[in-house]
Interface confidence: medium
Protein backbone atom coordinates (compact mmCIF):
# COMPACT_ATOMS: atom_id res chain seq x y z
CA UNK A 1 0.00 0.00 0.00
CA UNK A 2 1.17 3.44 -0.80
CA UNK A 3 2.11 6.12 1.42
CA UNK A 4 3.22 10.07 0.55
CA UNK A 5 6.62 11.04 1.79
CA UNK A 6 7.68 14.53 1.59
CA UNK A 7 11.59 15.74 1.49
CA UNK A 8 13.25 18.94 0.64
CA UNK A 9 14.35 19.23 -3.55
CA UNK A 10 17.62 20.81 -2.30
CA UNK A 11 19.76 20.68 0.49
CA UNK A 12 23.78 22.21 0.34
CA UNK A 13 26.01 19.93 2.24
CA UNK A 14 28.34 22.32 4.48
CA UNK A 15 31.99 22.60 4.40
CA UNK A 16 32.91 19.86 6.86
CA UNK A 17 30.33 17.81 4.20
CA UNK A 18 27.78 17.52 6.16
CA UNK A 19 24.04 17.60 4.81
CA UNK A 20 20.92 17.13 6.83
CA UNK A 21 17.02 17.52 5.49
CA UNK A 22 13.83 16.39 6.86
CA UNK A 23 11.60 13.36 5.44
CA UNK A 24 8.37 13.53 6.27
CA UNK A 25 5.51 10.77 5.88
CA UNK A 26 1.78 10.77 6.01
CA UNK A 27 0.83 8.16 7.93
CA UNK A 28 -2.54 6.07 7.37
CA UNK A 29 -2.16 3.80 10.24
CA UNK A 30 -0.91 3.35 13.72
CA UNK A 31 2.60 2.01 13.14
CA UNK A 32 4.75 0.97 16.30
CA UNK A 33 7.83 0.42 13.52
CA UNK A 34 9.12 2.04 10.89
CA UNK A 35 11.98 1.62 8.76
CA UNK A 36 13.53 4.78 6.94
CA UNK A 37 15.80 4.01 4.21
CA UNK A 38 18.03 6.77 2.23
CA UNK A 39 18.71 5.98 -1.02
CA UNK A 40 21.26 7.38 -3.93
CA UNK A 41 20.26 8.04 -7.35
CA UNK A 42 23.39 8.85 -9.83
CA UNK A 43 23.49 8.25 -13.31
CA UNK A 44 20.69 5.77 -13.08
CA UNK A 45 21.83 3.83 -10.29
CA UNK A 46 20.50 3.55 -6.72
CA UNK A 47 22.36 2.74 -3.87
CA UNK A 48 21.46 2.18 -0.64
CA UNK A 49 23.07 4.57 1.66
CA UNK A 50 22.28 3.97 4.92
CA UNK A 51 18.69 2.39 6.65
CA UNK A 52 17.24 2.01 9.91
CA UNK A 53 14.40 0.80 11.73
CA UNK A 54 12.81 2.31 14.71
CA UNK A 55 9.79 2.04 17.33
CA UNK A 56 7.59 5.45 17.51
CA UNK A 57 9.02 7.53 20.26
CA UNK A 58 12.48 6.22 19.84
CA UNK A 59 15.54 7.34 18.91
CA UNK A 60 16.51 6.01 15.46
CA UNK A 61 19.53 3.71 15.41
CA UNK A 62 21.93 3.58 12.38
CA UNK A 63 24.81 0.87 12.43
CA UNK A 64 27.98 2.00 13.69
CA UNK A 65 29.79 2.40 10.63
CA UNK A 66 26.93 4.50 8.90
CA UNK A 67 27.31 7.80 7.48
CA UNK A 68 23.90 8.55 8.56
CA UNK A 69 22.66 10.05 11.87
CA UNK A 70 19.11 11.02 12.90
CA UNK A 71 16.39 11.34 14.64
CA UNK A 72 12.46 11.08 14.62
CA UNK A 73 9.53 13.44 15.67
CA UNK A 74 5.78 11.76 15.32
CA UNK A 75 5.78 11.84 11.44
CA UNK A 76 9.02 13.49 10.46
CA UNK A 77 12.74 12.19 10.82
CA UNK A 78 14.83 14.65 10.70
CA UNK A 79 18.19 12.91 8.88
CA UNK A 80 22.22 14.20 8.62
CA UNK A 81 24.36 12.55 6.14
CA UNK A 82 27.81 13.35 6.93
CA UNK A 83 31.61 12.84 5.33
CA UNK A 84 30.22 13.88 2.04
CA UNK A 85 32.62 14.93 -0.21
CA UNK A 86 32.23 16.43 -4.34
CA UNK A 87 31.86 13.05 -5.86
CA UNK A 88 28.62 12.51 -3.64
CA UNK A 89 26.46 14.86 -5.09
CA UNK A 90 23.55 13.42 -6.40
CA UNK A 91 19.63 12.49 -5.85
CA UNK A 92 19.29 11.37 -2.50
CA UNK A 93 15.88 9.73 -1.72
CA UNK A 94 14.03 8.91 1.51
CA UNK A 95 12.25 5.63 1.48
CA UNK A 96 9.65 5.17 4.66
CA UNK A 97 8.00 1.16 5.49
CA UNK A 98 5.13 0.88 8.35
CA UNK A 99 6.71 -2.52 9.29
CA UNK A 100 4.05 -3.24 12.07
CA UNK A 101 1.38 -3.68 13.09
CA UNK A 102 -0.63 -4.42 9.54
CA UNK A 103 -0.86 -3.14 7.08
CA UNK A 104 2.48 -2.63 5.74
CA UNK A 105 2.79 0.65 4.21
CA UNK A 106 5.64 1.96 1.94
CA UNK A 107 6.38 5.29 0.18
CA UNK A 108 8.97 6.85 -1.31
CA UNK A 109 9.88 10.79 -1.30
CA UNK A 110 10.64 12.40 -4.92
CA UNK A 111 14.41 13.07 -3.65
CA UNK A 112 16.89 15.60 -2.25
CA UNK A 113 19.28 17.04 -4.11
CA UNK A 114 22.01 17.82 -2.26
CA UNK A 115 25.45 19.47 -3.70
CA UNK A 116 28.66 18.63 -2.24
CA UNK A 117 31.67 21.59 -2.77
CA UNK A 118 34.95 20.64 -1.64
CA UNK A 119 36.12 22.91 0.57
CA UNK A 120 39.31 25.21 -1.39
CA UNK A 121 42.53 24.21 0.56
CA UNK A 122 44.16 27.14 2.89
CA UNK A 123 46.96 28.55 1.21
CA UNK A 124 50.20 28.55 3.12
CA UNK A 125 50.33 32.10 5.28
CA UNK A 126 53.63 33.63 5.35
CA UNK A 127 54.55 35.22 8.77
CA UNK B 1 12.19 -23.74 0.08
CA UNK B 2 10.63 -22.18 3.46
CA UNK B 3 10.44 -24.39 6.50
CA UNK B 4 9.53 -23.94 9.94
CA UNK B 5 9.77 -26.44 12.64
CA UNK B 6 8.09 -26.32 15.94
CA UNK B 7 9.26 -28.29 18.84
CA UNK B 8 8.74 -28.45 22.77
CA UNK B 9 5.58 -29.48 22.54
CA UNK B 10 4.25 -32.37 25.55
CA UNK B 11 2.28 -33.03 28.07
CA UNK B 12 2.19 -30.67 31.36
CA UNK B 13 0.11 -29.94 34.43
CA UNK B 14 -2.39 -27.18 35.20
CA UNK B 15 0.13 -23.74 36.29
CA UNK B 16 2.90 -25.37 34.77
CA UNK B 17 5.36 -23.90 32.29
CA UNK B 18 6.27 -24.95 28.50
CA UNK B 19 8.76 -22.85 26.23
CA UNK B 20 7.97 -23.89 22.42
CA UNK B 21 10.31 -22.94 19.60
CA UNK B 22 10.44 -22.30 15.93
CA UNK B 23 13.27 -23.65 13.49
CA UNK B 24 13.02 -21.68 10.51
CA UNK B 25 15.05 -21.63 7.60
CA UNK B 26 15.09 -20.94 3.67
CA UNK B 27 14.32 -17.04 4.17
CA UNK B 28 15.80 -14.09 5.91
CA UNK B 29 14.49 -14.54 9.15
CA UNK B 30 15.10 -11.48 10.67
CA UNK B 31 12.88 -9.75 7.84
CA UNK B 32 9.73 -11.26 8.52
CA UNK B 33 7.24 -10.89 11.23
CA UNK B 34 6.60 -14.09 13.43
CA UNK B 35 3.42 -15.44 14.54
CA UNK B 36 1.74 -18.53 16.91
CA UNK B 37 -1.57 -19.50 15.88
CA UNK B 38 -3.02 -22.27 18.20
CA UNK B 39 -6.14 -24.91 17.35
CA UNK B 40 -7.46 -26.76 20.46
CA UNK B 41 -8.81 -30.47 19.65
CA UNK B 42 -11.61 -30.43 17.01
CA UNK B 43 -11.97 -26.18 16.70
CA UNK B 44 -10.86 -23.40 14.88
CA UNK B 45 -7.72 -21.65 14.46
CA UNK B 46 -7.02 -18.92 17.12
CA UNK B 47 -3.77 -16.47 17.00
CA UNK B 48 -1.68 -16.63 19.86
CA UNK B 49 0.61 -13.26 19.19
CA UNK B 50 3.14 -12.04 16.74
CA UNK B 51 6.49 -10.55 16.62
CA UNK B 52 7.79 -7.66 14.24
CA UNK B 53 11.12 -8.89 12.25
CA UNK B 54 13.26 -7.03 14.77
CA UNK B 55 11.46 -8.18 17.95
CA UNK B 56 10.89 -4.58 18.64
CA UNK B 57 7.12 -4.58 18.53
CA UNK B 58 5.26 -7.92 19.72
CA UNK B 59 1.33 -8.34 20.14
CA UNK B 60 -0.70 -10.84 21.85
CA UNK B 61 -4.38 -12.44 22.38
CA UNK B 62 -6.07 -11.13 25.19
CA UNK B 63 -6.67 -15.07 26.55
CA UNK B 64 -2.61 -15.29 26.64
CA UNK B 65 -1.99 -11.65 28.00
CA UNK B 66 0.44 -11.99 30.68
CA UNK B 67 0.85 -15.52 30.92
CA UNK B 68 2.89 -15.81 27.33
CA UNK B 69 5.90 -14.03 26.33
CA UNK B 70 6.67 -14.17 22.34
CA UNK B 71 10.30 -13.62 21.69
CA UNK B 72 12.67 -14.53 18.83
CA UNK B 73 16.36 -15.26 18.15
CA UNK B 74 17.44 -13.45 14.91
CA UNK B 75 20.92 -14.78 14.97
CA UNK B 76 19.79 -18.61 15.52
CA UNK B 77 16.74 -18.22 13.12
CA UNK B 78 14.61 -19.14 15.72
CA UNK B 79 11.10 -17.84 17.55
CA UNK B 80 9.33 -18.94 20.91
CA UNK B 81 6.22 -19.11 22.67
CA UNK B 82 7.28 -19.17 26.61
CA UNK B 83 3.42 -20.12 27.90
CA UNK B 84 3.45 -19.71 32.09
CA UNK B 85 0.16 -20.56 34.23
CA UNK B 86 -1.26 -22.91 31.59
CA UNK B 87 -4.55 -24.01 31.38
CA UNK B 88 -7.03 -26.41 30.21
CA UNK B 89 -8.03 -24.22 27.56
CA UNK B 90 -4.66 -23.90 26.28
CA UNK B 91 -4.33 -27.36 24.78
CA UNK B 92 -4.03 -26.98 21.32
CA UNK B 93 -1.88 -27.78 18.73
CA UNK B 94 0.36 -24.65 18.46
CA UNK B 95 2.05 -23.73 14.62
CA UNK B 96 4.58 -20.86 14.04
CA UNK B 97 3.41 -19.15 10.88
CA UNK B 98 5.23 -16.57 8.75
CA UNK B 99 3.69 -13.46 7.44
CA UNK B 100 4.76 -12.55 3.72
CA UNK B 101 7.75 -10.31 2.43
CA UNK B 102 5.61 -7.44 2.61
CA UNK B 103 6.01 -7.74 6.33
CA UNK B 104 2.36 -8.08 7.75
CA UNK B 105 0.33 -8.70 4.93
CA UNK B 106 -0.57 -12.33 5.88
CA UNK B 107 -0.08 -15.70 7.02
CA UNK B 108 1.76 -17.24 4.30
CA UNK B 109 3.99 -20.21 5.61
CA UNK B 110 3.25 -22.48 8.84
CA UNK B 111 4.76 -25.07 10.71
CA UNK B 112 3.44 -28.58 10.98
CA UNK B 113 2.87 -27.96 14.46
CA UNK B 114 3.55 -29.08 18.23
CA UNK B 115 0.65 -30.35 20.37
CA UNK B 116 0.41 -28.95 23.78
CA UNK B 117 -2.08 -30.48 26.66
CA UNK B 118 -2.45 -28.84 29.92
CA UNK B 119 -3.76 -32.05 32.19
CA UNK B 120 -3.52 -33.82 35.27
CA UNK C 1 -17.29 -16.81 19.94
CA UNK C 2 -15.01 -16.51 16.54
CA UNK C 3 -14.64 -12.62 15.32
CA UNK C 4 -15.11 -13.15 12.01
CA UNK C 5 -18.73 -15.40 11.13
CA UNK C 6 -18.74 -18.27 8.74
CA UNK C 7 -20.75 -20.71 8.38
CA UNK C 8 -19.98 -24.09 10.25
CA UNK C 9 -20.67 -26.13 7.27
CA UNK C 10 -21.66 -26.68 3.39
CA UNK C 11 -21.87 -29.14 0.62
CA UNK C 12 -22.44 -29.77 -2.28
CA UNK C 13 -21.90 -32.05 -5.72
CA UNK C 14 -18.73 -33.17 -7.69
CA UNK C 15 -18.77 -30.43 -10.46
CA UNK C 16 -21.00 -27.89 -8.31
CA UNK C 17 -19.58 -24.58 -7.19
CA UNK C 18 -20.25 -23.53 -3.61
CA UNK C 19 -19.75 -20.03 -2.06
CA UNK C 20 -18.56 -19.73 1.56
CA UNK C 21 -19.27 -16.50 3.66
CA UNK C 22 -17.45 -14.41 5.85
CA UNK C 23 -18.87 -11.34 7.61
CA UNK C 24 -16.87 -9.15 10.22
CA UNK C 25 -16.83 -5.65 11.67
CA UNK C 26 -15.34 -2.03 11.68
CA UNK C 27 -12.29 -3.21 12.89
CA UNK C 28 -11.23 -5.55 10.60
CA UNK C 29 -12.72 -6.30 7.05
CA UNK C 30 -14.43 -2.95 7.41
CA UNK C 31 -11.72 -1.06 8.32
CA UNK C 32 -10.04 -2.04 5.29
CA UNK C 33 -7.88 -4.78 5.83
CA UNK C 34 -7.68 -7.83 3.29
CA UNK C 35 -9.01 -10.93 3.84
CA UNK C 36 -7.39 -14.35 3.87
CA UNK C 37 -8.69 -17.58 3.04
CA UNK C 38 -6.98 -21.20 4.57
CA UNK C 39 -7.63 -24.48 3.24
CA UNK C 40 -7.00 -27.06 6.20
CA UNK C 41 -7.15 -31.31 4.77
CA UNK C 42 -7.91 -33.36 7.85
CA UNK C 43 -4.58 -34.20 9.70
CA UNK C 44 -2.67 -31.00 8.29
CA UNK C 45 -1.81 -27.77 8.79
CA UNK C 46 -3.45 -24.72 7.26
CA UNK C 47 -1.92 -23.88 3.57
CA UNK C 48 -3.10 -20.34 2.19
CA UNK C 49 -5.96 -20.62 -0.38
CA UNK C 50 -6.55 -16.92 -1.11
CA UNK C 51 -4.45 -13.79 -0.10
CA UNK C 52 -5.10 -10.42 -0.03
CA UNK C 53 -9.15 -10.74 -0.61
CA UNK C 54 -8.71 -12.41 -4.67
CA UNK C 55 -5.24 -13.22 -4.93
CA UNK C 56 -4.38 -17.54 -5.94
CA UNK C 57 -0.55 -18.43 -4.43
CA UNK C 58 1.31 -20.45 -7.53
CA UNK C 59 0.13 -23.50 -7.36
CA UNK C 60 -3.77 -22.91 -6.46
CA UNK C 61 -6.19 -24.23 -9.33
CA UNK C 62 -8.50 -21.13 -10.34
CA UNK C 63 -11.21 -22.95 -9.47
CA UNK C 64 -11.10 -21.14 -5.67
CA UNK C 65 -11.50 -17.71 -6.29
CA UNK C 66 -11.95 -14.87 -3.42
CA UNK C 67 -14.07 -11.61 -3.30
CA UNK C 68 -14.52 -8.67 -0.84
CA UNK C 69 -17.04 -6.29 0.08
CA UNK C 70 -17.82 -3.72 2.87
CA UNK C 71 -17.54 -5.69 5.69
CA UNK C 72 -17.98 -9.22 4.31
CA UNK C 73 -15.82 -11.62 1.96
CA UNK C 74 -16.67 -14.70 -0.24
CA UNK C 75 -14.45 -17.90 -1.12
CA UNK C 76 -15.99 -19.38 -4.09
CA UNK C 77 -15.26 -22.96 -5.14
CA UNK C 78 -16.78 -24.21 -8.73
CA UNK C 79 -16.16 -27.06 -10.39
CA UNK C 80 -15.85 -29.27 -7.10
CA UNK C 81 -13.92 -32.27 -6.39
CA UNK C 82 -13.69 -34.46 -4.08
CA UNK C 83 -10.16 -33.42 -2.56
CA UNK C 84 -11.79 -29.78 -1.87
CA UNK C 85 -13.31 -32.05 1.08
CA UNK C 86 -11.77 -29.52 3.96
CA UNK C 87 -11.88 -26.94 6.70
CA UNK C 88 -11.51 -23.82 5.22
CA UNK C 89 -10.80 -20.44 7.03
CA UNK C 90 -10.98 -16.67 6.76
CA UNK C 91 -8.73 -14.46 8.60
CA UNK C 92 -8.08 -10.50 8.79
CA UNK C 93 -6.26 -8.15 10.75
CA UNK C 94 -7.95 -6.11 13.32
CA UNK C 95 -7.07 -3.11 14.73
CA UNK C 96 -8.96 -3.22 17.95
CA UNK C 97 -7.91 -6.12 18.83
CA UNK C 98 -4.11 -5.84 17.48
CA UNK C 99 -3.81 -9.13 16.32
CA UNK C 100 -5.10 -11.53 13.72
CA UNK C 101 -8.77 -12.77 13.65
CA UNK C 102 -9.77 -15.59 12.22
CA UNK C 103 -13.63 -17.38 11.30
CA UNK C 104 -14.56 -20.35 13.04
CA UNK C 105 -14.20 -22.28 9.60
CA UNK C 106 -16.79 -23.92 7.17
CA UNK C 107 -16.10 -27.83 6.89
CA UNK C 108 -16.91 -28.36 3.21
CA UNK C 109 -18.16 -31.59 2.73
CA UNK C 110 -18.60 -33.28 -1.10
CA UNK C 111 -21.14 -35.44 -1.52
CA UNK C 112 -21.72 -38.24 -3.83
Known amino acids: KAMHVAQPAVVLANSRGTASFVCEYASPGKATEVRVTVLRQADSQVTEVCAATYMMGNELTFLDDSICTGTSSGNQVNLTIQGLRAMDTGLYICKVELMYPPPYYMGIGNGTQIYVIDPEPCPDSDF | EVQLLESGGGLVQPGGSLRLSCAASGFTFSSYSMNWVRQAPGKGLEWVSAISGSGGSTYYADSVKGRFTISRDNSKNTLYLQMNSLRAEDTAVYYC?????????????WGQGTLVTVSS | QSVLTQPPSASGTPGQRVTISCTGSSSNIGAGYDVHWYQQLPGTAPKLLIY???QRPSGVPDRFSGSKSGTSASLAISGLRSEDEADYYC???????????FGGGTKLTVLG
Open chain 3, 52 to 54: RNN
Open chain 2, 97 to 109: ARDRVEMNQWLAD
Open chain 3, 91 to 101: AAWDDSLNGWV
